[in-house]
Amino acid sequence: MMTGTIETTGNISAEKGGSIILQCHLSSTTAQVTQVNWEQQDQLLAICNADLGWHISPSFKDRVAPGPGLGLTLQSLTVNDTGEYFCIYHTYPDGTYTGRIFLEVLESSVAEHGARFQIP
């Protein structure tokens, strides 16, 4: 029986050009984590396999860094990075657990300020 739960950072926001850490944590189970997949929509970003280590998808190699831990760091953020991200925990003997994170990439605070408080 699957007793574990995935805790995530939930809904997060970050500034364009900055970086963000995507983090999930599996709790309430003694199951062994053997692989974690990170995805955006249906694009595979990275896989961390207990035996094989990290694999970063070639299309994200310049902007994705493994870690910390089983998490993933996204760098040089653009507004196109806004959307849902998924961590898929492969465990033994429980099976698969999934967590969801929604990332919103915002224009820089300076740009936001200028837009909201225009001088008449």
Epitope: D42, L44, E84, T96
Partner: antibody, heavy 118, light 107 residues
């Protein structure tokens, strides 16, 4: 338990539009996952056609993109496939399937055969 | 698109035999491969995902291994109900693609 059931005409004339519907029971298609169409010509392999996600995002196989449209009717918990300008090469068993996040398909409908013939 | 090449395309075996099917990806897909079983007139059934993980309820005689471009699917001891067609699928990037299938027949 999630169940998927395809329905639609079994015979379509060349150059017409093929229309199929998948009715999902036991799970709301707006709750999670991506809802796919996959086809299999008689005696051949499987071809992924596209999906509509729980949030309404669609993604199509580029080999079919100009001809395929996937939509949904959330009130009926259904999603649909339209394939335009069909030819005999589109004769196939059409399956609807639920995709798990990792890109694999743990649940399928039983499939429906569509023949393209005049 | 990533091409998945299965071999052999068909094979004959007897109950109790150990059977191995291979699948080669046209590019590195790390561990993003699934395996399905399909019986005549039925939909495919997921057996293995992420190269080596059995889906819920799948008997332990079915196993998968491999990473990168080379993958193997094994049935350790064939049962009468295992005679079917088997497909590999890459789940690395869209469009998701399948192998051409391996038909497993009774010898």
């Amino acid at each position: 338990q999630v169940q998927l059931q395809e329905s639609g005409p079994g015979l379509v004339k060349p150059s017409q539009t093929l229309s199929l519907t998948c009715t999902v029971s036991g799970y709301s298609i707006t709750d999670d996952y991506a809802w796919n169409w996959i086809r299999q010509p008689p005696g051949k392999g499987l071809e992924w056609m596209g999906y509509i996600s729980y949030s309404g995002i669609t993604r199509y196989n580029p080999s079919l993109k100009s001809r395929v449209t996937i939509s949904r009717d959330t009130s009926k918990n259904q999603f649909s496939l339209k394939l335009s300008s069909v030819t005999a090469a589109d004769t196939a068993v059409y399956y609807c399937a639920r995709k798990y996040y990792g890109g694999w398909f743990p649940q399928w409908g039983q499939g429906t055969l569509v023949t393209v013939s005049s | 698109d990533i091409q998945m090449t299965q071999s052999p395309s068909s094979l004959s075996a007897s109950v109790g035999d150990r059977v191995t099917i291979t699948c080669k990806a046209s590019q590195d897909v790390f561990t993003a491969v699934a395996w399905y079983q399909q019986k005549p007139g039925k939909a495919p059934k997921l057996l293995i995902y992420s190269a080596s993980y059995r889906d819920t309820g799948v008997p332990s005689r079915f196993s998968g291994s491999g990473s990168g471009t080379d993958f193997t699917f094994t049935i350790s001891s064939l049962q009468p109900e295992d005679f079917a067609t088997y497909y590999c699928q890459q789940s690395y990037s869209t469009p998701w693609t399948f192998g051409q299938g391996t038909r497993l027949e009774i010898k």
